[in-house]
Interface confidence: medium
């Protein structure tokens, strides 16, 4: 079976002039997933991102996250890239506080 992830992109204040953007994927199966941040369509270097482990979410599916710190005002240049079971999608940083997108393939 394959269950596509729900992708949730959030932002939070980090320090003056910077924000932390977090991309969470949840409810997916199997556990193999690629989640990373891209700037202008190019993957950020590994050292500038932080990842959570892939963990069971209690419903027979899995969850994980990736975060990075960016300059406030440049949000539109960043997208979260997700690949799962041969399908992929990109998710923008919300202009408000929270944006929830269900992947549809």
């Amino acid at each position: 079976r394959t269950v596509p992830p729900m992708v949730n992109v959030t932002r939070s204040e980090a320090s003056e002039g910077n924000i932390t953007v977090t991309c969470r994927a949840s409810g997916f199966y199997p556990w193999n997933i690629t989640l990373s941040w891209r700037q202008d369509g190019v993957s950020l270097s590994h050292d500038t991102q932080q990842w959570g482990d892939v963990l069971p979410d209690g419903n027979g599916t899995y969850q994980t996250w990736v975060a990075t710190r960016i300059c406030q005002g440049e949000e539109q240049r960043f997208t979260c890239y997700m690949e799962h079971s041969g399908n992929h999608s990109t998710h923008p940083v919300p202009s408000g506080k929270v944006l929830v997108l269900q992947s549809h393939w």
Epitope: N32, T34, S36, H46, W51, D53, L55, E83
Partner: antibody, heavy 119, light 108 residues
């Protein structure tokens, strides 16, 4: 800095249980999983199994009937137990950290410990 | 299980030359889960390239990786003396996670 160190008996008798520990530092056992891999003398690498951060395990089917991987967070240690060993289990045994953003690649390895199975 | 076949088994080249190492999978592997390791005698393997084409931390840019599906390649543009070692490809696409048998890169 991140370090992993395997330890255990260098000699195990046939039919007995091989027991190794992997002591780690520089990262949290509740944040990273660990793999066990072995390498027979002069040969290639073979994946034995791994433990996730929630202590669930995933084993190579070739070992599943006789392998146990566990974690003791209070000691910063992972352990490997392989029962009913034979001479074919003689190998260098490695523990390696499961990287996050490296898409499950093994980003840090211990130096390995040689285990010889012989009577 | 997914079998990874590396070729050639041994590659004899001189410093300064270009090395091309191949890894062929018995079934398709997501490019995200195909990695390369370098192992020198008496040492543990070291992560070289992750997700087909991304350099691991501290790896010089003379190393590069490419490929998709079942065919993957590791290239060293200009060999340095310290590059002579055994190279393994590794798939984390499907359990059991497997390694190729290795390519030994030796000095000619």
């Amino acid at each position: 800095q991140v370090q992993l160190q395997e330890s255990g008996p260098g000699l195990v008798k046939p039919s007995e249980t091989l027991s190794l520990t992997c002591t780690v530092s520089g990262f949290s056992l509740t944040t990273y999983g660990v793999h066990w891999i072995r390498q027979p003398p002069g040969k290639g690498l073979e994946w034995i199994g791994m433990i996730w951060t929630d202590a669930t395990t995933d084993y190579n089917a070739a070992f599943i009937s006789r392998v146990t991987i566990s974690v003791d967070t209070s000691k910063n240690q992972f352990s490997l137990k392989l029962s009913s060993v034979t001479a074919a289990d003689t190998a260098v045994y490695y523990c390696a950290r499961k990287g996050h953003g490296y898409y499950y690649a093994m980003d840090y390895w211990g130096q390995g410990t040689l285990v010889t199975v012989s009577s | 299980e997914i079998v990874l076949t590396q070729s050639p088994g041994t590659l004899s080249l001189s410093p300064g030359e270009r090395a091309t190492l191949s890894c062929t999978a018995s079934s398709s592997v997501s490019s995200s889960y195909l990695h390369w390791y370098q192992q020198k005698p008496g040492q543990a393997p070291r992560l070289l390239i992750y997700s087909t084409s991304n350099l691991a931390s501290g790896i010089p840019d003379r190393f590069s990786g490419s490929g998709s599906g079942t065919d993957f390649t590791l290239t060293i543009s200009r060999l340095e003396p310290e590059d002579f070692a055994v190279y393994y490809c590794h798939q984390y696409h499907r359990s059991p996670f497997t390694f190729g048998q290795g390519t030994k890169l030796e000095i000619k």
